[in-house]
Interface confidence: low
């Protein structure tokens, strides 16, 4: 996939920033707001931030600029720079009236068919598990194979460096074709097939990618919020995987929830399958020692481990992946829509 150019975005924060720089009032306000960061810590939802008057004034100035509605894209060039601008501007939106975080990512959904050649899979035993088959599909694709080998190398060995491993994982889930990435991670296993389940759980190399000692979940979130990319991915996940009703209907679409979920892999908030016998997922963190924030901690943890929208989105994608191999397709090469709306 070619990376989206700025011009393909409705209102890229990079473009808006350049426009702002050409206007002395806007430029001064942006710089001032940027310097306000240290004096305004990101408050907990229960706290009111105390904001210096000059920062409020700068925020007010920016509210009239094109920066205020700017967005970024998950696969754009200079994504981190774009997100940096987004979160600086976000303060202008939220100062004075604490606003819940809004995903910085614009949804540019492409519906390009994904060509898969299943005939090459005949080198596998017919009864091979689907996780093995999806791994083979990745191997048969040059780009997927190259990206997978890169993170496999970075994440293996007794002395793997976690930060390097995470960076390569992030790159894989960002640059590999979405159906390949989803097939690899969300491959279905028979309930009693522990080998398949173990293969799936090990897809993201948890021994290296996940912290050796589970940190407190709120500490993990604090760490995540200090990084524009991680913060963006977490907010995107909370936006698109929010259950809207008791049936677990997602706030937007299941496909967007899954994209947001995969976007977290390689960040500080990397989730994974909990065991090799089911499809439950969780963050690698604990709520022990949360004191009077126990409830807030459990809510964060529950957004991963007890989220009916996410559970149903994963289950639907796995059903879809099962069908790919269970049906008699007319030709060994067939096209599958890359972005299914499975709601």
């Amino acid at each position: 996939d070619p990376l989206p150019t700025e011009s393909r975005l409705m209102n890229s924060c990079l473009q808006a920033r350049r426009k702002c720089q050409a206007d002395p009032t806007c430029s001064a306000a942006y710089h001032h707001l940027d310097s306000c960061t240290s004096s305004i810590s990101t408050p907990l939802p229960s706290e009111e931030p105390s904001v210096p008057a000059d920062c409020l004034e700068a925020a007010q100035q920016l509210r009239n600029s094109s920066l205020i509605g700017c967005m970024c894209h998950r696969r754009m060039k200079n994504q981190v720079a774009c997100l940096d601008i987004y979160w600086t501007v976000h303060r202008a939106r939220s100062l004075g009236n604490y606003e819940l975080d809004v995903s910085p990512y614009e949804d540019t959904v492409t519906s390009k068919p994904w060509k898969m050649n299943l005939s090459k899979l005949n080198m596998l035993k017919p009864d091979s598990d689907l996780c093995l088959k999806f791994a083979m599909l990745c191997t048969l694709n040059d780009k997927c194979d190259r990206l997978r080998k890169a993170y496999g190398e970075a994440c293996s060995g007794p002395h793997c460096q976690r930060h390097v491993c995470l960076r390569q994982l992030l790159t894989f889930f960002e640059k590999a074709a979405e159906p390949h990435a989803q097939g690899l991670l969300l491959c279905p296993c028979a309930p009693n097939d522990r080998g398949c389940g173990e293969r799936r759980r090990n897809t993201i190399a948890p021994n290296c990618a996940l912290p050796p000692v589970a940190p407190n979940c709120l500490e993990l979130r604090r760490l995540c919020f200090s990084d524009p990319l991680c913060r963006s991915r977490l907010v995107d996940f909370q936006t698109h995987c929010h259950p809207m009703d008791i049936l677990g209907t997602c706030a937007t679409e299941q496909s967007r929830c899954l994209r947001a979920y995969l976007g977290l892999i390689g960040t500080a908030m990397t989730p994974n399958f909990v065991s090799n016998v089911n499809t439950s997922v969780a963050l690698s963190c604990t709520c022990r020692g949360s004191g009077n924030l126990q409830e807030e901690c459990e809510m964060l943890e529950g957004f991963f481990s007890h989220n009916p929208c996410l559970t149903e989105a994963i289950a639907a994608k796995m059903r879809f992946h099962s069908q790919l191999f269970s049906q008699d397709w007319p030709h060994p090469t067939f096209a599958v829509m890359a972005h299914q709306n499975e709601n």
Epitope: D245, L247, Q294, E295, M299
Partner: antibody, heavy 123, light 107 residues
Framework: EVQLLESGGNLVQPGGSLRLSCAAS????????MTWVRQAPGKGLEWVST????????YYADSVKGRFTISRDNSRDTVFLQMNSLRAEDTAVYYC????????????????WGQGTLVTVSS | DIQMTQSPSSLSAFVGDRVTITCRAS??????LDWFQQKPGKAPKSLIY???NLQSGVPSRFGGSGSGTDFTLTINSLQPEDFVTYYC?????????FGGGTKVEIK
């Protein structure tokens, strides 16, 4: 400590109305869906109604639809059940409940319960 | 609506016995099932959530298992305070439904 305290139960004639309240404390009330469940004397448990944390979504059992209305006041941490056109078969202890923090997304979970309030419909 | 069939409706046992109560759903409810204990004149109390997870503060003699349509509540070594009524409840599908209850009586 999380607490739910129901009130408003009483003896009422068929066709009459009653308003039950459930006062909550010890948790962030607006983050949680709240549910009413009832139990007729000597019988099992029956789900009555659920309201989302914001109050924008409400759900009712077929047996009470059109007669009962669930609502909440997040500024007072209270959930209400307005019962109209009461029938003898509505006689029951009415409990309010909520999911635990771990399962706040599962609106239909009932991890914490109040002590209940008795509604008797009889002439 | 999903029907929850609980069996037996009542059982008699001795203190120290191991008892099993089953709950069958009319269709697949994954692991979205809870078990409650209710003492006479009291509100129900949550024992097991998501089929097999023990609520905090609940004695370890209680255990839950199952997924799909068949679920089991097991009480190992019955204590005098366990001779009460037990209910299952599904929350996989709207509306939520309860089993009819199982009354555990002392022999």
């Amino acid at each position: 400590e999380v607490q739910l305290l129901e009130s408003g139960g009483n003896l009422v004639q068929p066709g009459g109305s009653l308003r039950l309240s459930c006062a909550a404390s010890g948790f962030t009330f607006s983050s949680y869906a709240m549910t009413w469940v009832r139990q007729a004397p000597g019988k099992g448990l029956e789900w009555v109604s659920t309201i989302s944390g914001s109050g924008t979504s409400t759900y009712y059992a077929d047996s009470v639809k059109g007669r009962f209305t669930i609502s909440r006041d997040n500024s007072r941490d209270t959930v209400f059940l307005q019962m109209n056109s009461l029938r003898a078969e509505d006689t029951a202890v009415y409990y309010c409940s909520k999911p635990s923090a771990l399962r706040f997304l599962h609106w239909l979970c009932m991890d914490v319960w109040g002590q209940g309030t008795l509604v008797t419909v009889s002439s | 609506d999903i029907q929850m069939t609980q069996s037996p409706s009542s059982l008699s046992a001795f203190v120290g016995d191991r008892v099993t109560i089953t709950c069958r759903a009319s269709q697949d409810i994954r692991n979205y099932l809870d078990w409650f204990q209710q003492k006479p004149g009291k509100a129900p109390k949550s024992l097991i959530y998501a089929a097999s997870n023990l609520q905090s503060g609940v004695p370890s003699r209680f255990g839950g298992s199952g997924s799909g349509t068949d679920f089991t509540l097991t009480i190992n070594s019955l204590q005098p305070e366990d001779f009460v009524t037990y209910y299952c409840q599904q929350y996989n599908s709207y509306p939520p439904t309860f089993g009819g209850g199982t009354k555990v009586e002392i022999k």
